[in-house]
């Protein structure tokens, strides 16, 4: 069942799914100047059986200028750099990711994909939070959020994480205002994951991670 809302936003933190539950959908988005091929699916879908999960459908982008062709346009140097970075990140992720039953790994990049990945999570999905560089974590509990369903309505649990600047006093600050509305559901923001393309920064973030490599950030 799709989560009809999004993981809470924690100030100075990003979130990441270590693996994606079966049923998760990823939009096939293309970068500017490209579009999804006409016969292509608008989504990739994490699907599987009891022993193996994988992404159904492959996203394919073609030049917007092209007519009924999937011929790829030779990328400019900066585009090549961006793609190479994404591929390196993907390899890092795959090496780091655990194989969870009923879950898919981060899908590899496709040619001319958009810099932003939009996932549609399902009930039972867990995402993990990490403070951005320059901020440190103050925990009161797990720095994770789980999509749950109650009475047909979906909601994400509130992660017990506060990110404080390195120069700020070390005493525990007040609890961050929860992202839940008075009627008990979190704010409906988009599950937008933006691929980070600065590999230097990415490596530094990755080096500080204990459980997984962060290659995306919450938008």
């Amino acid at each position: 069942e799709l989560c009809d809302d999004d993981p809470p936003k924690i100030t100075h933190a990003t979130f990441k799914a270590v693996a994606y539950k079966e049923g998760t959908m990823l939009n096939c988005e293309c970068k500017r100047g490209f579009r999804r091929i006409k016969s292509g699916s608008p989504y990739m879908l994490c699907t599987g059986n009891s022993s193996h999960s994988s992404w159904d459908n492959q996203c394919q982008c073609t030049s917007s200028a092209a007519r009924n062709t999937t011929k790829q346009v030779t990328p400019q140097p900066e585009e090549q750099k961006e793609r190479k970075t994404t591929e390196m990140q993907s390899q890092m992720q795959l090496a780091d990711q655990v194989s969870l039953p009923g879950h898919c790994r981060e899908p590899p990049p496709w040619e001319n994909e958009a810099t932003e990945r939009i996932y549609h999570f399902v009930v039972g999905q867990t995402v993990y939070y990490q403070c951005v560089q320059g901020y440190r974590a103050l925990h009161r509990g797990p720095a994770e959020s789980v999509c749950k369903m109650t009475h047909g309505k979906t909601r994400w649990t509130q992660p017990q994480l506060i990110c404080t600047g390195e120069t700020e006093p070390s005493q525990f600050p007040g609890e961050e205002e929860p992202q839940a509305s008075p009627d008990g559901l979190p704010e409906s923001e988009t599950s937008r994951l933006v691929t980070t393309t600065d590999f230097r920064i990415q490596t530094e973030v990755a080096a500080t991670m204990e459980t997984f490599i962060f290659t995306t950030e919450y938008q």
Epitope: E1, L2, K153, R155, P186, S188, E189, R192
Partner: antibody, heavy 116, light 106 residues
Framework: QVQLVQSGAEVKKPGSSVKVSCKAS????????MHWVRQAPGQGLEWMGY????????EYNQKFKDKATITADESTNTAYMELSSLRSEDTAVYYC?????????WGQGTLVTVSS | DIQMTQSPSTLSASVGDRVTITCSAS?????MHWYQQKPGKAPKLLIY???ELASGVPARFSGSGSGTEFTLTISSLQPDDFATYYC?????????FGQGTKVEVK
């Protein structure tokens, strides 16, 4: 109490556009996605898409991607759906429905008639 | 897209009858939701997550099923139950509905 109040019926010429509104009250507008569902005369329900009011992010049924544009105005707690290049086949009742899971609250519907 | 096929399309019944509507999904889904609609009115949530009754819905309504086959049952049809019923899946985009089952007076 939660209410979704839609704009009144419209009669439009083929090729024109129409913008249907859905004003929400009784809950935090930005806390729930707003979905739109179409029902042609004597037909079933078709999901068109949704908007996340806080971010303005939209997701569409591919069938309506080039037909509908969903927007929202946080300041007035109102969601909108604009239909372009109207044809007779677009004659239908258009409903807004509160998301966050199952559609527990619906607008009363707006009948859009496309006729020359 | 997941196609939802309801049967029957029309059902003629009398007050007191036991009524069963089935909905078949073209792929396995997590849950089925059911809506009731009366002429000129917006749909109303009836059953969510396959078998849970929405607020204010009488206990004569029940839902069951799993995977691709789901059922809505009205144990003893009442005058207020003559309406059109729609099944609905929200396991994957695009969200889809069944074509509807009209329960009419016999």
């Amino acid at each position: 109490q939660v209410q979704l109040v839609q704009s009144g019926a419209e009669v439009k010429k083929p090729g024109s556009s129409v913008k249907v509104s859905c004003k929400a009250s009784g809950y935090t507008f930005t806390s729930y996605r707003m979905h739109w569902v179409r029902q042609a005369p004597g037909q079933g329900l078709e999901w068109m898409g949704y908007i996340s009011p806080r971010k303005g992010y939209t997701e569409y049924n591919q069938k309506f991607k080039d037909k509908a544009t969903i927007t929202a105005d946080e300041s007035t707690n109102t969601a909108y759906m604009e239909l372009s290049s109207l044809r007779s086949e677009d004659t239908a009742v258009y409903y807004c429905a509160r998301g966050g899971g199952v559609f527990d609250y619906w607008g009363q519907g707006t009948l859009v008639t496309v006729s020359s | 897209d997941i196609q939802m096929t309801q049967s029957p399309s029309t059902l003629s019944a009398s007050v007191g009858d036991r009524v069963t509507i089935t909905c078949s999904a073209s792929s396995s889904i997590s849950y089925m939701h059911w809506y009731q609609q009366k002429p000129g009115k917006a749909p109303k949530l009836l059953i969510y997550t396959t078998s849970e009754l929405a607020s204010g819905v009488p206990a004569r309504f029940s839902g069951s099923g799993s995977g691709t086959e789901f059922t809505l049952t009205i144990s003893s049809l009442q005058p207020d139950d003559f309406a059109t019923y729609y099944c609905h899946q929200r396991s994957t985009y695009p969200l889809t509905f069944g074509q509807g089952t009209k329960v009419e007076v016999k």
